[in-house]
């Protein structure tokens, strides 16, 4: 015998209290698949979260973060404070990158400058707190007397800011 609940489409639930008829999901709830016996409560985007997509009867709300914060975790389960380029977030707040490291985004960690010699290349543009070095040709490719290092390009916002 076919389960009568299998006929209930997304946006409804199979209501045991009403002889297993398909009832619409109540306000602030949803069912994203058919044949559900309950509707799920919609996620609420509060505080540092803001609504990216409203809840509907067939899909959950989606949150992102208010300006100055960025998403972390699956489905933006957490919001983390932004820092400036050239900084990283520590337990004590935003701290400048140490010499030899950089961060070209408002999130994430300071990473070591690329080791150009790893690829047999020279440093074409010096690194800064906000920018990685740019590796150039191998030292053998440089013409005699040519300067191998260019001063770093000035870092500007937004730089490699997360979208």
């Amino acid at each position: 015998l076919q389960d009568p609940c299998s006929n209930c489409p997304a946006g409804t639930f199979c209501d045991n209290n009403r002889n297993q008829i398909c009832s619409p999901c109540p306000p602030n709830s949803f069912s994203s698949a058919g044949g559900q016996r309950t509707c799920d409560i919609c996620r609420q985007c509060k505080g540092v979260f803001r609504t990216r997509k409203e809840c509907s009867s067939t899909s959950n709300a989606e949150c992102d973060c208010t300006p100055g914060f960025h998403c972390l975790g699956a489905g933006c389960s957490m919001c983390e404070q932004d820092c400036k380029q050239g900084q990283e977030l520590t337990k004590k707040g935003c701290k400048d990158c140490c010499f030899g490291t950089f961060n070209d985004q408002k999130r994430g960690i300071c990473r070591p400058w690329t080791n150009c010699s790893l690829d047999g290349k020279s440093v074409l543009v010096n690194g800064t707190k906000e920018r990685d070095v740019v590796c150039g040709p191998s030292p053998a490719d440089l013409s005699p007397g040519a300067s191998s290092v260019t001063p770093p390009a000035p870092a500007r916002e937004p730089g490699h800011s997360p979208q």
Epitope: N115, C116, D119, V125, P158, G159, Q163
Partner: antibody, heavy 119, light 107 residues
């Protein structure tokens, strides 16, 4: 020598998912970003996102945030891109690329993987 | 996102001709501008990085110049093997973006 070898062509039905692989060799996999780039038929190039295999840190183009998931397996020097809820507009050649020296240009490209979405 | 306006979209030139392609980002990208060649078989190759730096192994007939919001790619003497589509790309700001490409044909 540096090589990026991608998995073969895929044909998928709308709504399905596909996972494209990119096996790197000839360099230290964990020291360079791997990027993914889309080229739809007759179109230009679109950056999807990238991953730093050392710690699996990722960046995504907002346009592809709900479409693509980029991962990396350090033990096999392989990067992956999974595309979900496929639609006809996802039909394209997908390239993996490596950054050049620092994360601002792409010096090596895979041969491309054609993904066709058709019912 | 930074828009990259590349022109022309296609051009036809003779062997030995000087060929110039321009790329104009919608905002200042310093020198973080790269040029790629895509051959008819779909293989892609980096030719020039950081505006004017020739990638090792790339023939010296290819060159690049410019800064900020105005960049130029030049082939000083076109060769038959240069038949390809050429793309510019900015590496200054995420998401990285490409020009729409210039399809180069031999007359």
């Amino acid at each position: 020598q540096v090589q990026l070898v991608q998995s073969g062509a895929e044909v998928k039905k709308p709504g399905a998912s596909v996972k494209v692989s990119c096996k790197a060799s000839g360099y230290t996999f964990t020291s360079y970003w791997i990027n993914w780039v889309k080229q739809a038929p007759g179109q230009g190039l679109e950056w999807i996102g990238n991953i730093y295999p050392s710690d699996s840190y990722t960046n995504y183009n907002q346009k592809f945030k709900d479409k693509a998931t980029i991962t990396a397996d350090k033990s096999t020097s392989t990067a992956y891109m999974e595309l979900s809820s496929l639609r006809s507009e996802d039909t394209a050649v997908y390239y993996c690329t490596r950054d050049y020296g620092s994360s601002y240009s792409f010096d090596y490209w895979g041969q491309g993987t054609t993904v066709t979405v058709s019912s | 996102d930074i828009q990259m306006t590349q022109s022309p979209s296609s051009l036809s030139a003779s062997v030995g001709d000087r060929v110039t392609i321009t790329c104009r980002p919608s905002q200042d990208i310093s020198n973080y501008l790269n040029w790629y060649q895509q051959k008819p078989d779909k293989t892609v190759k980096l030719l020039i990085y950081y505006t004017s730096r020739l990638r090792s192994g790339v023939p010296s007939r290819f060159s690049g110049s410019g800064s900020g919001t105005d960049f130029t790619f030049t082939i000083s003497s076109l060769q038959p093997e240069d038949i390809a589509t050429y793309f510019c790309q900015q590496g200054d700001t995420l998401p990285y973006t490409f020009g729409q490409g210039t399809k180069l044909e031999i007359k």
